[in-house]
Structures are given as structure tokens and as C-alpha cells.
Interface confidence: low
Amino acid sequence: SAGAGSHCQKTSLRVNFEDIGWDSWIIAPKEYEAYECKGGCFFPLADDVTPTKHAIVQTLVHLKFPTKVGKACCVPTKLSPISVLYKDDMGVPTLKYHYEGMSVAECGCR
Amino acid sequence: SAGAGSHCQKTSLRVNFEDIGWDSWIIAPKEYEAYECKGGCFFPLADDVTPTKHAIVQTLVHLKFPTKVGKACCVPTKLSPISVLYKDDMGVPTLKYHYEGMSVAECGCR
């Protein structure tokens, strides 16, 4: 798995809803693949981490003043939905096909 | 300035183009306010860091398994342009009013 020494990339993160206390309202699935963005944003920033101009600037400033300015951060840049069966406000089981923003589609340096 | 112990926020970051080697093609300004996003994404994530669902989930998983899963990261979520006078490919000084993505407008937890 990607650690701090490796470049920014998408890694597996299985999330169990019971672990985060969401099993009280999410009926299914019991767990899902959320993914996590892990790794460093090292100079030079590669195209596959889709750096913004600000991220490029910050990376260059970090090279010059590493104790003063941090590196850019490896974060989700695109998210995808999952399907969930949840209890609505009335406790009625409701299926949401696209519960947005729950799983990482792409990581990048920001 | 905001450190790791403080909450995610926008802090000042003055960038001198000479420091990053961009003075070879950017004529003016000599420096600009890029800002930097600094601070931690601590539970509970406040509305002002506009967390995605994934960031909320990751924060909760981090609470449960802090050594396995990292916190969400404080990054620019909205960028703004600056105006620059630069040398084009022919070396001709050219004014670009909106050189996009150079300065942080907002920070958030992702």
C-alpha cells in the first residue's frame, strides 16, 4: 500500500458502516470500498496527479523553504457514488442508487 | 500562522517568483499572495471546511483506526487568478489579466 514515501495514488480503504456508527441508518451494504488517497506530492509533480498551478507553485516554494511551507497534499480530486439502502426520516427503508461523493475515483496533488 | 494543531484555514504565503525560478518568464509582479491551506481536519469537521462525504467518512475511520487511516487533508478547494505580465514564446511582454489557479480563495477538508 502507498505510504508517505511513495507517490500520490489511490489505495484500498474498506469502510465498515458499523465501525463509523452509520449502521444505525444505513441498512446495506454493510461495508464498501471508499478508497483513500495516499502518498506524497513530490517534485516534479507528474501529470497523473493533475496538479493545479497553485500546487506546482507550493511544491517549488517547499523545495526552497521546506520548514516554512508544506508540500501539496494527496487528496481525492474526483468522487463517485455508491448505492445504499438507508432508513429515511420516518424509518422507512429507502434505496438511493447514487449516494454521491462516497468513493474516490481519482487522486491528485492539491 | 496556522499549524498542525489548529483547524484547517487559509494563511498567508507570499511567493517571490525569483525563489521558484519563474522570474525568467514572469516580468511582473515580482511576488504575489498565493496563500496556503494549513491546519488539521479534526473531528467533527465544521461546515466552513465544506467536507465531502468521503472526507467525513475518512475522518470517522481515522478516529477508529488512527494508525491505519490518515485524516482528511486541508487543501485549496477554490482558487482565484492573478494578473501577470509575462514573456510569450517569442519573448514579447504579454499581459494576462486572469492567470487562473494561482491563489487560494478557499480551503477545505478533502
Epitope: R14, A28, P29, S83, T94 | -
Partner: antibody, heavy 119, light 107 residues
Framework: QVQLLESGGGLVQPGGSLRLSCAAS????????MSWVRQAPGKGLEWVSI???????HYADSVKGRFTISRDNSKNTLYLQMNSLRAEDTAVYYC?????????????WGQGTLVTVSS | DIQMTQSPSSLSASVGDRVTITCRAS??????LNWYQQKPGKAPKLLIY???NLQSGVPSRFSGSGSGTDFTLTISSLQPEDFATYYC?????????FGQGTKVEIK
Amino acid sequence: QVQLLESGGGLVQPGGSLRLSCAASGFTFSSYAMSWVRQAPGKGLEWVSITLGTGHTHYADSVKGRFTISRDNSKNTLYLQMNSLRAEDTAVYYCARGSYIIWSALDYWGQGTLVTVSS
Amino acid sequence: DIQMTQSPSSLSASVGDRVTITCRASQDIRSYLNWYQQKPGKAPKLLIYDASNLQSGVPSRFSGSGSGTDFTLTISSLQPEDFATYYCQQSDTSPLTFGQGTKVEIK
């Protein structure tokens, strides 16, 4: 133990109709998604339809508008009403249980029932 | 719809061999990939669910790995009863789709 038993297969002419049944036992039927999967002679598996524990239904494009999946939770029975049958619908039809209430792995399967569409 | 592509479509192996079958999804299916074994005239049997979880009662020589778009089923030491056809299937979303199958034959 979990058991699924299909019935209703047989020989039918093109354009005809057939209704398959799947009797389930050994588990709380209403809490699981149930699917129909078919296999043409000498071919691979093709998913046909699903009814979620919520009552939502989905179909493969190849059967949409012709087949209807339904369930009777009081009778622990799954159905597949097949209309406007075509020669390419000839297959062994399996009833399978999803491992939970929405789409998931198919953890238990019936023995299958053969549907032959021929004139 | 999500397309599932298995490779190889068939393979010949001997008892004791290590066998690997791959499955590729046309788009990200996270870890929602399942593997089935089918013997002639029989119903399919679930081996692995959610990419890497061994179904109860399945021998530990079967294992699965992968996430996203690329997945692998491995049989660490092929046994006589393992000669069969293997299918992958995605359960990320409807319509559920199967791979075309991999037939494991005796060499």
C-alpha cells in the same frame, strides 16, 4: 439450510409465454435480493433480472419489456413471467439468492429449470 | 453497462499446479467482484465474494485479489475436483454482469 427449487420450465413456441417459480426455504426470504440467471446450451452465465429486498426490480436489456420478475414474500416464492419468447431465450434458468438486500454476490443457487423455445 | 472480460478463456493444467485467472472490468467496480465455479450439469457455486473474501466451506487453496478494474482468482495447488469453468461477476451495480468464463481442463 438454504434451498431454492425452480419449476415451470418446458417447451414453448416462439411468441409464447411461460412463468417460472422458485420456492425458497431456510432463510428470511424478504430480507434478500433474488435474481434469475440463465445459461444457454454450451454458453456462459447471463444475468436476467433481480428483485431487491426493497421491491425494486432490474432487468438485462435483452429481456426488458418482455420479462417480469416478482416475489411473494408470504409464500417465500420468486417468479419470472416470460412473454414474447424467442429462440435465443432457450436456456437453463437458475434462481439465485443475493447475499444481502441489494445487489451482491449470489451465494445460493437452485438446480435450474430448462426453457426451450422452439416451433 | 459494465463489461467483464476474463482471460484466458481456457487453460490446461496438472494436479498440483498453481493456476491464475484474471478478470477485467470496463470501469471501476471498487471491490465488488465475485468468483464462481461451475461443473457440467450443475449450478454455479460461489467461491470468492467482494474480491478477496472466501465463501464459507470453500477450500483455502482458492484466493482472490484486486480492486478497481483488475482482479485475480488463484488456485494455489490444483486438485482433481477443481477442473471446472470459472466465472467472475460484478455486483457493483445493476445490471449485474458476468465474465465469459474460463475453462480449466486436465493437461
